[in-house]
C-alpha cells in the first residue's frame, strides 16, 4: 500500500511536471528553431560571397551559446558577443536603410534596391527575423512552451537583447549618409521607445555618418499633409543635430508609386514628385 | 595552414586512447574540427565535430564510445573503450562552410588482444 | 543522421570515357556537398565543393552538379590517373537532433 502510494504520487508528480516549468506571457521558442537558424546561415552565405568564410556551425553554436542555460530575463549584451563577433560584416557607405514600424515596406525596397541594406539583409538580422527563442536556467533544453514577453516579464529576454545588440552595431558601423524609413500612418511617427528611437539613433557615430535622412511613408492616398512637420519628427531631429548629424526629411506620399519608380526609375510617371 | 595527427599505436581492447591534432595557422575558434575514421579497405565516415565555440557533436554510432575536445592548438580525440572494430586510420580534418578542405595525413590504430 | 547513398558502387569504363556517380542525401542538404577522390594509401583529395565548384588545381573533367537532396559527379575524357574511389560527402552542420555531416559509401571507378 505504501509503495503504491508513492507510486501514485510519483505518477501525479510526472504528470504535473510541464506545469513546473516556468510560465512566461510570451509565445515559445519558433518551432524548429536550431534547423531553421542553421538552414539560413547555410542559404546567407551561398548567396552572399563575402560571407563564404563564416561556419554556419561555430555561427549556430554561439548562437545557442547565448541563451541556452541561462534564465531568461538575465541575458545581457555579452552573451551575444560570440556571435557578433562571427558575424561581422560591413554595410559601404551611404547604404544603411534603418526602419520603425514599417518592416515590410523596408523589406520590400532592399530586395529592389540591391545595394541597400537593412538590418534583416545582414547575416545575424536574416537568422534571427521572425523567430522567438528562450532557454531555461540550468538545462540545456530550448523553451518551446512560453518565453518572456518584453512588457510583461521582462525586457532582458533573449529576443529582446539580441534586437539591442545587433542593433546596436549595426548602427555603430553606418557612415555617409544614413535613410531611416518611418510609418506616417502611426501617431507616434519617430517613437523615442523603437528600436530606432532607443537605441539606434543614439548610437550612430556623428564622425562617420553626415547625415539622416528620413523617408515618412504616407498611409492614406489622399494624405498631402507634410509629415516632416510632425512634433515627434522634430524631436527626432532636435535629438539628431545635438549629436553633429545633419538631418534631412522627405515624404513618401505614395509607397506604392515609390517602389515601382524605384523599379523603374526611367518612367515617366516617376519624374514628378512621390 | 596544416594539421597533423598523432598517437595511433597498437592497444588492448579496453584500453583509452587519445589522439591528438596539432594545428598550425589555423584559429579554431571560428573554424569546425571533425574527425574522421577509415577501417581498412572501408570507407570514410564521421565520428564527431567540434566547432569553433566549442560545442561537440557526435554520430549516433559514435556517441558514449568517443570524446572530442580542444586546446587552442590542438584538437584531441579520445577513444574510451576500444574495440577491435575501432582498427581504422583515423583522419583530423577542418570543415569550413565551402567543405571538408584539410586534411591530416592520418594516424593509424590497431586495437588487438 | 544524415544518410548519404551513393550509386554505383562499383563502375567500369574505357579512357576517354565518360563516368557519372550520383548521390543522394536523406534531407535537404542546399548545396552543401563535396566530391573527393581517394588513391590507396593516401588521404582523399577535394574534388568539388558547394556541390558544383572545382577545387584549386582540380581538372575541368571533373564536374558536379545537383543541389537539395540529388547530386551528380561526371568524369568526363576518363583517364588511367582516375582509376580511384570517389566519396560524396555532406558538410550541412549540426544541431542537438541532427547530425549533418556523413560520407557515402564511395564508388570505385576502375579504368580499362
Known amino acids: 500500500s505504501g509503495l503504491n502510494d508513492i507510486f501514485e504520487a510519483q505518477k501525479i508528480e510526472w504528470h504535473e511536471l510541464p506545469r513546473w516549468r516556468q510560465q512566461w506571457s510570451g509565445s515559445g521558442t519558433t518551432s524548429r528553431f536550431p534547423e531553421t537558424v542553421l538552414a539560413r546561415c547555410v542559404k546567407y552565405t551561398e548567396v552572399h560571397p563575402e560571407m563564404r568564410h563564416v561556419d554556419c556551425q561555430s555561427v549556430w553554436d554561439a548562437f545557442k551559446g547565448a541563451f541556452i542555460s541561462k534564465y531568461p530575463c538575465n541575458i545581457t549584451e555579452e552573451d551575444y558577443q560570440p556571435l557578433v563577433k562571427l558575424g561581422t560584416q560591413t554595410v559601404p557607405c551611404n547604404k544603411t536603410l534603418l526602419w520603425s514600424r514599417i518592416k515590410d515596406l523596408a523589406h520590400q525596397f532592399t530586395q529592389v534596391q540591391r545595394d541597400m541594406f537593412t538590418l534583416e539583409d545582414m547575416l545575424l538580422g536574416y537568422l534571427a527575423d521572425d523567430l522567438t527563442w528562450c532557454g531555461e536556467f540550468n538545462t540545456f533544453e530550448i523553451n518551446y512552451q512560453s518565453c518572456p514577453d518584453w512588457r510583461k516579464d521582462c525586457s532582458n529576454n533573449p529576443v529582446s537583447v539580441f534586437w539591442k545588440t545587433v542593433s546596436r552595431r549595426f548602427a555603430e558601423t553606418a557612415c555617409g549618409v544614413v535613410h531611416v524609413m518611418l510609418n506616417g500612418s502611426r501617431s507616434k511617427i519617430f517613437d523615442k521607445n523603437s528600436t530606432f528611437g532607443s537605441v539606434e539613433v543614439h548610437n550612430l557615430q556623428p564622425e562617420k555618418v553626415q547625415a539622416l535622412e528620413a523617408w515618412v511613408i504616407h498611409g492614406g492616398r489622399e494624405d498631402s499633409r507634410d509629415l516632416c512637420q510632425d512634433p515627434t519628427i522634430k524631436e527626432l531631429e532636435s535629438i539628431i543635430s545635438k549629436r553633429n548629424i545633419r538631418f534631412f526629411c522627405k515624404n513618401i506620399y505614395r509607397p506604392d508609386k515609390f517602389l515601382q519608380c524605384v523599379k523603374n526609375p526611367e518612367d515617366s510617371s516617376c519624374l514628378s514628385g512621390i | 595552414q596544416s594539421l597533423e595527427e598523432s598517437g595511433g599505436r597498437l592497444v588492448t581492447p579496453g584500453t583509452p586512447l587519445t589522439l591528438t591534432c596539432t594545428v598550425s595557422?589555423?584559429?579554431?575558434?571560428?573554424?569546425?574540427m571533425a574527425w574522421v575514421r577509415q577501417a581498412p579497405g572501408k570507407g570514410l565516415e564521421y565520428i564527431g565535430i567540434?566547432?569553433?565555440?566549442?560545442t561537440t557533436y557526435y554520430a549516433t554510432w559514435a556517441k558514449g564510445r568517443f570524446i572530442v575536445s580542444k586546446t587552442s592548438t590542438t584538437v584531441d580525440l579520445k577513444i574510451t573503450s576500444p574495440t577491435t572494430e575501432d582498427t581504422a586510420t583515423y583522419f583530423c580534418?577542418?570543415?569550413?562552410?565551402?567543405?571538408?578542405?584539410?586534411w591530416g595525413p592520418g594516424t593509424l590504430v590497431t586495437v588487438s588482444s | 543522421d544524415i544518410v548519404m547513398t551513393q550509386t554505383p558502387a562499383s563502375v567500369e569504363a574505357a579512357v576517354g570515357g565518360t563516368v557519372t556517380i550520383n548521390c543522394q542525401a536523406s534531407q535537404n542538404i542546399y548545396s552543401n556537398l563535396a566530391w573527393y577522390q581517394q588513391k590507396p594509401g593516401q588521404r582523399p583529395k577535394l574534388l568539388i565543393y558547394?556541390?558544383?565548384t572545382l577545387a584549386s588545381g582540380v581538372s575541368s573533367r571533373f564536374k558536379g552538379s545537383g543541389s537539395g537532396t540529388e547530386f551528380t559527379l561526371t568524369i568526363s575524357d576518363l583517364a588511367s590517373a582516375d582509376a580511384a574511389t570517389y566519396y560524396c560527402q555532406s558538410y550541412y552542420g549540426a544541431t542537438s537532433s541532427s547530425f549533418g555531416y556523413g560520407f557515402g559509401g564511395g564508388t570505385e571507378v576502375v579504368v580499362k
Open positions: 558547394k556541390a558544383s
Open positions: 580534418v577542418r570543415t569550413t562552410v565551402q567543405s571538408t578542405d584539410l
Open positions: 595557422g589555423i584559429d579554431l575558434s571560428i573554424y569546425t
Open positions: 567540434i566547432s569553433g565555440y566549442g
